[in-house]
């Protein structure tokens, strides 16, 4: 008998998955920027806001050159999972003041989930370790006040914006190494 019949190609490969992840990240970055601007218009921020439960920014411009594929994808996935939990929390516990932004927050959550699925597919195809997040999941209690939920929203959108910004740069750099 001759060689066995081959398999038809599936819809994408790791390089295409990485391209797709870059496009999704850029699109999510634009959404986040727009939503953060809406927040500032509706609820002007008095300075920078932070939230202890948010992940610390993983990369700086100086460390971009030394990025390795496994580290970037693992860290990005863990951080985005944290932001997804925070967006879900905002939608659930944000109170009446944030209800006006519900459609935008819902769309943001859906895009975040889609990007996470694409990153996971990429990591599976490359057979990179997909460890569960190391840090224990901090339970997110209800905001102390209406202003507390607005401050939290500013912090979440600001942090997500910075994370996605380095993610785009990091993923573009990694494209040259795959």
């Amino acid at each position: 008998p001759g060689p066995p019949a081959g398999s038809p190609r599936v819809s994408s490969d790791p390089r295409a998955d990485l391209d797709s992840a870059v496009l999704l990240t850029r699109s999510l970055l634009a959404d986040t920027r727009q939503l953060a601007a809406q927040m500032r218009d509706k609820f002007p921020a008095d300075g920078d806001h932070s939230l202890d439960s948010l992940p610390t920014l993983a990369m700086s411009a100086g460390t971009l050159g030394s990025l390795q594929l496994p580290g970037v994808l693992t860290r990005l996935r863990v951080d985005l999972m944290s932001y997804l939990r925070h967006v879900q929390w905002l939608r659930r516990a944000g109170g009446p003041s944030l209800k006006t932004l519900e459609p935008e927050l819902g769309a943001l959550q859906a895009r975040l989930e889609r990007l996470l699925r694409r990153l996971q597919l990429l990591m599976s195809r490359l057979a990179l370790p997909q460890a569960a997040p190391d840090q224990p999941v901090i339970p997110l209690g209800p905001p102390a006040s209406a202003w507390g939920s607005i401050r939290a929203a500013h912090a979440i959108l600001g942090g997500l914006h910075l994370t996605l910004d380095w993610a785009v740069r990091g993923l573009l750099l990694l494209k040259t190494r795959l």
């Epitope: 081959g6 398999s7 490969d13 996971q120 599976s124 195809r125 057979a127 370790p129 460890a131 795959l178």
Partner: antibody, heavy 114, light 111 residues
Framework: EVQLLESGGGLVQPGGSLRLSCAAS????????MHWVRQAPGKGLEWVAV????????YYADSVKGRFTISRDNSKNTLYLQMNSLRAEDTAVYYC???????WGQGTLVTVSS | QSVLTQPPSASGTPGQRVTISCSGS?????????VHWYQQLPGTAPKLLIY???ERPSGVPDRFSGSKSGTSASLAISGLRSEDEADYYC???????????FGGGTKLTVL
């Protein structure tokens, strides 16, 4: 068209060794993580081992840890599985698979028996 | 004993719709890890049928669809045909293994 062609299977005595190979073509082998998955006669699929696209990560099922070694040669588009201290319960069809796994070979039968 | 639980068998008549379930836990399916489905026709190698919960590879008919909710997933086959008679396996990443884990498989019989 993607092809994965396993070879190296056969009959071996308990305690013996065997080396399986998997020749890949039709896709960018060096961009894919590669797996070995086995299927005992009449049973389900059991994941055996995985190696990352560049060979830097290797993981094994508990049942083969310390006995089997997965490796790859990206310049030859070939995946390997070195199997030592073989046991009767290792008898199975061994499939090489790429990616999720997205692609599977036709398998090679390994029989461990005295 | 598989980490992912599937019914050992399922059946249906031609044209019917059948669903095969795959139950996991909070450490695999329930932890943002995607589910993939494989079809293994008698005497052949497995073939990827659904990836990332609901995506179909090119060449897979749209009669096959996948979904995931919480810690479980399901594969639906509509317009059942005799050639769909096969074993179906679900798989998901298991972080404790650093590899995929397979369900025990479901033998689908077309009556």
């Amino acid at each position: 068209e993607v092809q994965l062609l396993e070879s190296g299977g056969g009959l071996v005595q308990p305690g013996g060794s065997l080396r399986l190979s998997c020749a890949a073509s039709g896709f960018t082998f060096s961009s894919y993580g590669m797996h070995w998955v086995r299927q005992a006669p009449g049973k389900g699929l059991e994941w055996v081992a995985v190696i990352s696209y560049d060979g830097s990560y290797k993981y094994y099922a508990d049942s083969v840890k310390g006995r089997f070694t997965i490796s790859r040669d990206n310049s030859k588009n070939t995946l390997y599985l070195q199997m030592n201290s073989l046991r009767a319960e290792d008898t199975a069809v061994y499939y090489c698979a790429a990616g999720v796994p997205d692609y599977w070979g036709q398998g090679t039968l390994v029989t461990v028996s005295s | 004993q598989s980490v992912l639980t599937q019914p050992p068998s399922a059946s249906g008549t031609p044209g019917q719709r059948v669903t095969i379930s795959c139950s996991g836990s909070s450490s695999n399916i329930g932890s943002y890890y995607d589910v993939h489905w494989y079809q293994q026709l008698p005497g052949t190698a497995p073939k990827l049928l659904i990836y990332s919960n609901e995506e179909r590879p090119s060449g897979v008919p749209d009669r096959f669809s996948g979904s995931k909710s919480g810690t479980s997933a399901s594969l639906a086959i509509s317009g059942l045909r005799s050639e769909d008679e096969a074993d179906y396996y679900c798989a998901a990443w298991d972080p404790s293994l650093y590899g995929p884990v397979f369900g025990g498989g479901t033998k689908l019989t077309v009556l």
